[in-house]
C-alpha cells in the first residue's frame, strides 16, 4: 500500500507541512453496504486503527511519495456474518509530533469512502482512491475466523432455533442459507429432530422439548407450556423478563436466548444483529459511479452493474486508466477527464483521436476556399485571396507583398485589395502607363517591348483584364459565401473545443 501525491499533481508535498516530524495513521471503518445517512457515523461492521507507525521527518528534496507507512495489516474484526457488500471508509490521519501547545496535533489528511462487494476467503483486491491531491493505494480482503466458513463466514449458531435444511441444531447465520458447518457428533440417542449439540457427546434440546435425550415434550412435564419447571416440590415458576421479550428481531426473524443475550434467526434475504439489513437489491444502489444496476429485483437474485465509460469492476468501483490503451494516434497527448477522453494532437494532426494527417489532402481540406496541393510526400494549401497560413485559416494581409506597381498605394478590402495608382499609371495593379499625349494606355513594359504593335497588344490586355475582372467577381461571390460558412463553423468548433477541454480539466 502507499499514500502520497497523485501523479501529475505537481511537486510531491510533505504530509508534515514543514512543521517537524509527524506520523501517519490509517483508520479503517466498515459499514453495512446499504447504510443510510442516518447511520453515517456508525462503523457497524467494525473499525480499527493502524499500529506500529514509523515517524516521518521531512528532509529537503525528499519525495513524499515514499512515505514510511504503518507496518503490516490493519485488521478489522467483525462479530456477525460477513455481509458481502459493505462500505469501506479509510481515513489518513497525521499526528504532528513537534512541540505544540496542548500536546500532539491531529489532522485528517484524506478520507476515501466507497461501497465494495467482496466474498470472504477470496484473494486480495487492489484499489486506488484519489481525494484532493492525495492518492491512496491499498489492498483488502475478508477472511473467516474458524469455525466460520464460506463466502459469508457461516458459523455454527449457539441458539435453540428450529431445525433448518442444514440439519439438527445447525442454521446459517448469514443471508447464505446453503452454507453450513458439519454437525458435531452428539450423545448417542439424542433426538435428531428435537436435540442438537455444540460440543461432542452432548444433547441440547430445542424449545418445547426436554429430557436427557430431548425426547420428552415440555407439555408432559408437571408444568404448562408457558412455565418453566422449578426446583423439586416448588411447583412452576413464571418466566421473568428475558432478552427476547418484545421480539427484537425485525422482518420476521425468530429470537433465541443465548447466555443472557439474544440471537435472531433471520429469514432468507435478511441479516444483521436484528435482521434489520436486507439482501442487496438494485434499489439499494450497489453500483458505484452512476453504474446501471440490472437484475437484483429481490434479495435472492443477483444483480449486475453496467459501468459508465472509464469505470470497471463488479460494482463499477475501479477507475480505468483509459490512456494506458494509448488511444491517441500519431503521438497525441491523452487526457482522461473521467467522463470523457480527450486527445491533444501534435501539429499536423487532427480528429478526436488525432487520426487525420493534415500533411495528406485526404486528411482535411484547406479552409476558406483554399485548395489542397499534394507533392513530395507532403501537402500545402493554395489559399484564396485574403487568406494564408498552413490551412488557410489565417487572414492574410493582401498588401504585404506590395502588389501595386509604380508606387501605387495598396488598400486591403474585404474581397482582396485595391490599388490607388500614382499619376501616369492605371490598371488593377497600376501596371499600365498612361501616354501623356492622350493615346491608349500600354503596359509599362521593358524598353525593348514598348515598340511592339500597340493595337494588338492593347486588345490582348483588355481581354485579359475582362477575364480577370469576371474571375474576381465570381471568386468574390463564392469566397464570401464559403468563407462566412467555414469561418463560422471552424471558429465555433475551435472555441467550443478549447472551452470544453478547459472546462473539463477544471472539473
Amino acid at each position: 500500500h502507499s499514500f502520497g501525491p497523485g501523479p501529475g499533481l505537481g511537486t510531491p508535498r510533505s504530509p508534515c507541512n514543514a512543521r517537524g516530524p509527524c506520523r501517519l495513521f490509517f483508520r479503517v471503518c466498515l459499514k453495512p453496504g446499504v447504510s443510510q445517512e442516518a447511520t453515517e457515523s456508525l462503523c457497524a461492521l467494525g473499525a480499527a486503527l493502524s499500529t506500529s507507525v514509523p515517524v516521518y521527518t521531512e528532509h529537503p528534496g525528499e519525495s513524499a511519495a515514499a512515505l514510511p507507512l504503518p507496518d503490516g495489516l490493519v485488521r478489522v474484526p467483525f462479530r456477525d456474518a460477513w455481509p458481502g457488500t459493505f462500505s469501506l471508509v479509510i481515513e489518513t490521519w497525521r499526528e504532528q509530533l513537534g512541540e505544540h501547545a496542548g500536546g500532539p496535533a491531529w489532522n485528517l489528511l484524506a478520507r476515501v469512502v466507497g461501497r465494495r462487494r467482496l466474498a470472504a476467503g477470496g484473494p486480495w483486491a487492489r484499489d486506488v482512491q484519489r481525494t484532493g491531491t492525495w492518492e491512496l493505494h491499498f489492498s483488502y480482503r475478508a477472511r473467516c475466523e474458524p469455525p466460520a466458513v464460506g463466502a459469508a463466514c457461516a458459523r455454527l449458531c449457539r441458539s435453540r432455533s428450529a431445525p433448518s435444511r442444514c440439519g439438527p441444531g445447525l442454521r446459517p447465520c448469514t443471508p447464505f442459507p446453503d452454507e453450513c458447518e458439519a454437525p458435531s457428533v452428539c450423545r448417542p440417542g439424542c433426538s435428531p429432530e428435537h436435540g442438537y449439540c455444540e460440543e461432542p457427546d452432548e444433547c441440547r434440546c430445542l424449545e418445547g422439548w426436554t429430557g436427557p435425550l430431548c425426547t420428552v415434550p415440555v407439555s408432559t412435564s408437571s408444568c404448562l407450556n408457558s412455565r418453566v419447571p422449578g426446583p423439586a416440590s416448588t411447583g412452576c415458576l413464571l418466566p421473568g423478563p428475558g432478552p427476547c421479550d418484545g421480539n427484537p428481531c425485525a422482518n420476521g426473524g425468530s429470537c433465541s436466548e443465548t447466555s443472557g443475550s439474544f440471537e435472531c434467526a433471520c429469514p432468507r434475504g435478511f441479516y444483521g444483529l436484528r435482521c434489520e439489513v436486507s439482501g442487496v437489491t438494485c434499489a439499494d444502489g450497489p453500483c458505484f459511479n452512476g453504474g446501471l444496476c440490472v437484475g437484483g429485483e429481490d434479495p435472492d437474485s443477483a444483480y449486475v452493474c453496467h459501468c459508465p465509460p472509464g469505470f470497471q469492476g463488479s460494482n463499477c468501483e475501479k477507475r480505468v486508466d483509459r490512456c494506458s490503451l494509448q488511444p491517441c494516434q500519431n503521438g497525441g497527448l491523452c487526457l482522461d477527464l473521467g467522463h470523457a477522453l480527450r486527445c491533444r494532437c501534435r501539429a499536423g494532426f487532427a480528429g478526436p483521436r488525432c487520426e487525420h494527417d493534415l500533411d495528406d489532402c485526404a486528411g482535411r481540406a484547406c479552409a476558406n476556399g483554399g485548395t489542397c496541393v499534394e507533392g513530395g510526400g507532403s501537402r500545402r494549401c493554395s489559399c484564396a485571396l485574403g487568406f494564408g497560413g498552413r490551412d488557410c485559416r489565417e487572414r492574410a494581409d493582401p498588401c504585404a507583398s506590395r502588389p501595386c506597381a509604380h508606387g501605387g498605394r495598396c488598400y486591403a478590402h474585404f474581397s482582396g485589395l485595391v490599388c490607388a495608382c500614382a499619376p501616369g499609371y492605371m490598371g488593377v495593379r497600376c501596371e499600365f502607363a498612361v501616354r501623356p499625349d492622350g493615346a491608349d494606355a500600354v503596359p509599362a513594359a521593358p524598353r525593348g517591348l514598348r515598340q511592339a504593335d500597340p493595337q494588338r497588344f492593347l486588345a490582348g490586355v483588355i481581354a485579359v483584364i475582362v477575364v480577370v475582372v469576371i474571375a474576381i467577381v465570381a471568386g468574390i461571390v463564392v469566397l464570401v459565401i464559403s468563407r462566412k460558412k467555414r469561418m463560422a463553423k471552424y471558429e465555433k468548433a475551435e472555441i467550443k473545443e478549447m472551452g470544453e477541454m478547459h472546462r473539463e480539466l477544471n472539473a
Epitope: 446499504v34 443510510q36 445517512e37 476515501v112 469512502v113 466507497g114 461501497r115 434499489a283 439499494d284 444502489g285 450497489p286 453500483c287 459511479n289 452512476g290 453504474g291 446501471l292 444496476c293 453496467h306 459508465p308 465509460p309 467522463h339 470523457a340 478526436p352 473539463e504
Partner: antibody
C-alpha cells in the same frame, strides 16, 4: 417499488425563479446519482444537470444552456433532490423529469414549467 | 457535444409488423447507447442499454444492435402497447445527448 415524484412546476415570467423538488422512495437514495432531464413541448429529451454523492463531495455538472442559472442540490436525509432555476427564459419551458444514475434508469412522472409573459 | 441523428422521425406500422429505427452518432460512441420508450403524457422508460442489452422487464421482442456510429432498435413483432415515441441516447461522452425521437403510429 421505486418512485420518484417531482413537484414545484408552474407558470413563471421570464427572468423569474422556480424551485423544483424530486422526492424518492423505494431506493437507498444516498447511493444514487441524480439528474434532471427536460422535454420542451413536442420536442426531444435534453439533459439539464446532475448531482453525485456525498463521497463525491456532491459534485454537480450542468448543460451549457443552463450553466450559471440553474443549481442542483440534494438532501439525503429527506431523500430529495432540488433544481433551483433562476433567470428563467421562455426556452426553459418544458416538462422536467428527475432520473437516477448515469444511464437514467428510474424516472419520475415529470413536472411542467411554463415561462411566459 | 455528440449529435445523435434518429431516423425516421415517424413511421406507421401495423400490429405484428417488424419495425426498425436507426440512430447515427456524429462520432464513435462505442456501444454506449441506450434506447428509451415514451408514451404520450408519460415519462420515458429505459429499454436497451449498452447498445444491445435488454433492461429488466423489457419484452424479448425489443432488441438493439450496432457499435461505433450506427445503431438500430428493432421490434420484431409490433404489439398494441408498443405504439409510442422512441429515443436513442449516447452515454460515451459527457454530456449525454439524445436523438430527436421516432414516433411509431398505427397504420
Amino acid at each position: 417499488e421505486v418512485q420518484l415524484v417531482e413537484s414545484g412546476g408552474g407558470l413563471v415570467k421570464p427572468g423569474g425563479s422556480l424551485r423544483l423538488s424530486c422526492a424518492a422512495s423505494g431506493i437507498t437514495f444516498s447511493n444514487f446519482w441524480m439528474n434532471w432531464v427536460r422535454q420542451a413541448p413536442g420536442k426531444g429529451l435534453e439533459w439539464v444537470g446532475q448531482i453525485r454523492l456525498k463521497s463525491d463531495d456532491y459534485a454537480t455538472h450542468y448543460a451549457e444552456s443552463v450553466k450559471g442559472r440553474f443549481t442542483i442540490s440534494r438532501e439525503d436525509s429527506k431523500n430529495t433532490v432540488y433544481l433551483q432555476m433562476n433567470s428563467l427564459k421562455t426556452e426553459d419551458t418544458a416538462v422536467y423529469y428527475c432520473t437516477t444514475g448515469y444511464y437514467f434508469d428510474y424516472w419520475g412522472q415529470g413536472t411542467t414549467v411554463t415561462v411566459s409573459s | 457535444n455528440i449529435q445523435m441523428t434518429q431516423s425516421p422521425s415517424s413511421l406507421s406500422a401495423s400490429v405484428g409488423d417488424r419495425v426498425t429505427i436507426t440512430c447515427k452518432a456524429s462520432e464513435n460512441v462505442g456501444t454506449y447507447v441506450s434506447w428509451y420508450q415514451q408514451k404520450p403524457g408519460k415519462s420515458p422508460k429505459l429499454l436497451i442499454y449498452g447498445a444491445s442489452n435488454r433492461y429488466t422487464g423489457v419484452p424479448s421482442r425489443f432488441s438493439g444492435s450496432g457499435s461505433g456510429t450506427d445503431f438500430t432498435l428493432t421490434i420484431s413483432s409490433l404489439q398494441p402497447e408498443d405504439f409510442a415515441t422512441y429515443y436513442c441516447g449516447q452515454f460515451y461522452s459527457f454530456p449525454s445527448t439524445f436523438g430527436g425521437g421516432t414516433k411509431v403510429e398505427i397504420k
